[in-house]
Interface confidence: medium
Amino acid sequence: FERTRSLQDPCSNCPAGTFCDNNRNQICSPCPPNSFSSAGGQRTCDICRQCKGVFRTRKECSSTSNAECDCTPGFHCLGAGCSMCEQDCKQGQELTKKGCKDCCFGTFNDQKRGICRPWTNCSLDGKSVLVNGTKERDVVCGPSPADLSPGASSVTPPAPAREPGHSPQ
């Protein structure tokens, strides 16, 4: 098919970075300013993406590849190819319609993006809370109470006595 196409279609000889210009008897012309073609044989060049506002340029547009954007400090990318920028929050917060809000008791977020997630329920695995959870950190589960009984062998050494941790109901 490719061979047939190249015999019949002069545009197939136009490399990436050019377009097949019908106004010039189908000869290859360079992509105009602010445009690109990533494959050969194209009849038009695509307009380069503009990284404006909250977007900033990560990679400049070239004659053969589109510009790539990321987000200005204080924002992070969402969607394929960083199609959106979303505001960062602090660790221990999540973004709501009303802005950044602290995580509710029993939940945490250890990143500047995403939602608050429930603390791990250690008791579901038959374990106890070794380190309490906070808004920024999940609880750390320790050995099960049975592992701490006299004579039981445990990989994890017994934890020092401490306040019992909170785990979500």
Partner: antibody, heavy 120, light 111 residues
Framework: EVQLVQSGAEVKKPGASVKVSCKAS????????THWVRQAPGQGLEWMGI????????SYAQKFQGRVTMTRDTSTSTVYMELSSLRSEDTAVYYC?????????????WGQGTMVTVSS | QSALTQPASVSGSPGQSITISCTGT?????????VSWYQQHPGKAPKLMIY???KRPSGVSTRFSGSKSGNTASLTISGLQAEDEADYYC???????????FGGGTKVTVL
Amino acid sequence: EVQLVQSGAEVKKPGASVKVSCKASGYTFTSYYTHWVRQAPGQGLEWMGIINPSGGSTSYAQKFQGRVTMTRDTSTSTVYMELSSLRSEDTAVYYCARGAPEYSSSSDYWGQGTMVTVSS
Amino acid sequence: QSALTQPASVSGSPGQSITISCTGTSSDVGGYNFVSWYQQHPGKAPKLMIYDVSKRPSGVSTRFSGSKSGNTASLTISGLQAEDEADYYCNSYTTSSTRWMFGGGTKVTVL
């Protein structure tokens, strides 16, 4: 007769900006792209960027991204090149050049050049 | 983005032929037939001598010819004349974000 007439010589201090103009005549202004090329004293030619006078779209050389702005005024058939945050290395003759028909691969007419000196 | 590579100088006697090379990569000279050559006399603006590798603008002497092989383009001046003494620059379209690149220039001296 095709002509590209550029503005006069400029002397600027480091950190300042300069705006060079290039007035076209003798052809349909919006049908031909305009390149900007510079030449430091005793050095070679350096491509800076290109503007489509019809739509105003631009492509700049990576070296000048963020410092150069090319604009046009179709009512006066004039193209402008503004370079900001000037440093001594920007001392050069700045040329505008008409892209050959239909944005071919070359520049067939050139302005006379504008000498820009950056000195404290 | 480094410039295309040209010899710093080439010389010849009147009537001789000389060739100036312009070496790039497959991303510029080798990838496209968009190579042009410019002549520049001291204190003057450049003048287009060859475009699209081998095409001559009207008004340019037939003594000037261009060609390309692989990643190297060449400008040949036959029947060298005193007025050919000048700097010559090649220029190519490129896949980089710097769309057009010049060579470093070649000083042609007529002995």
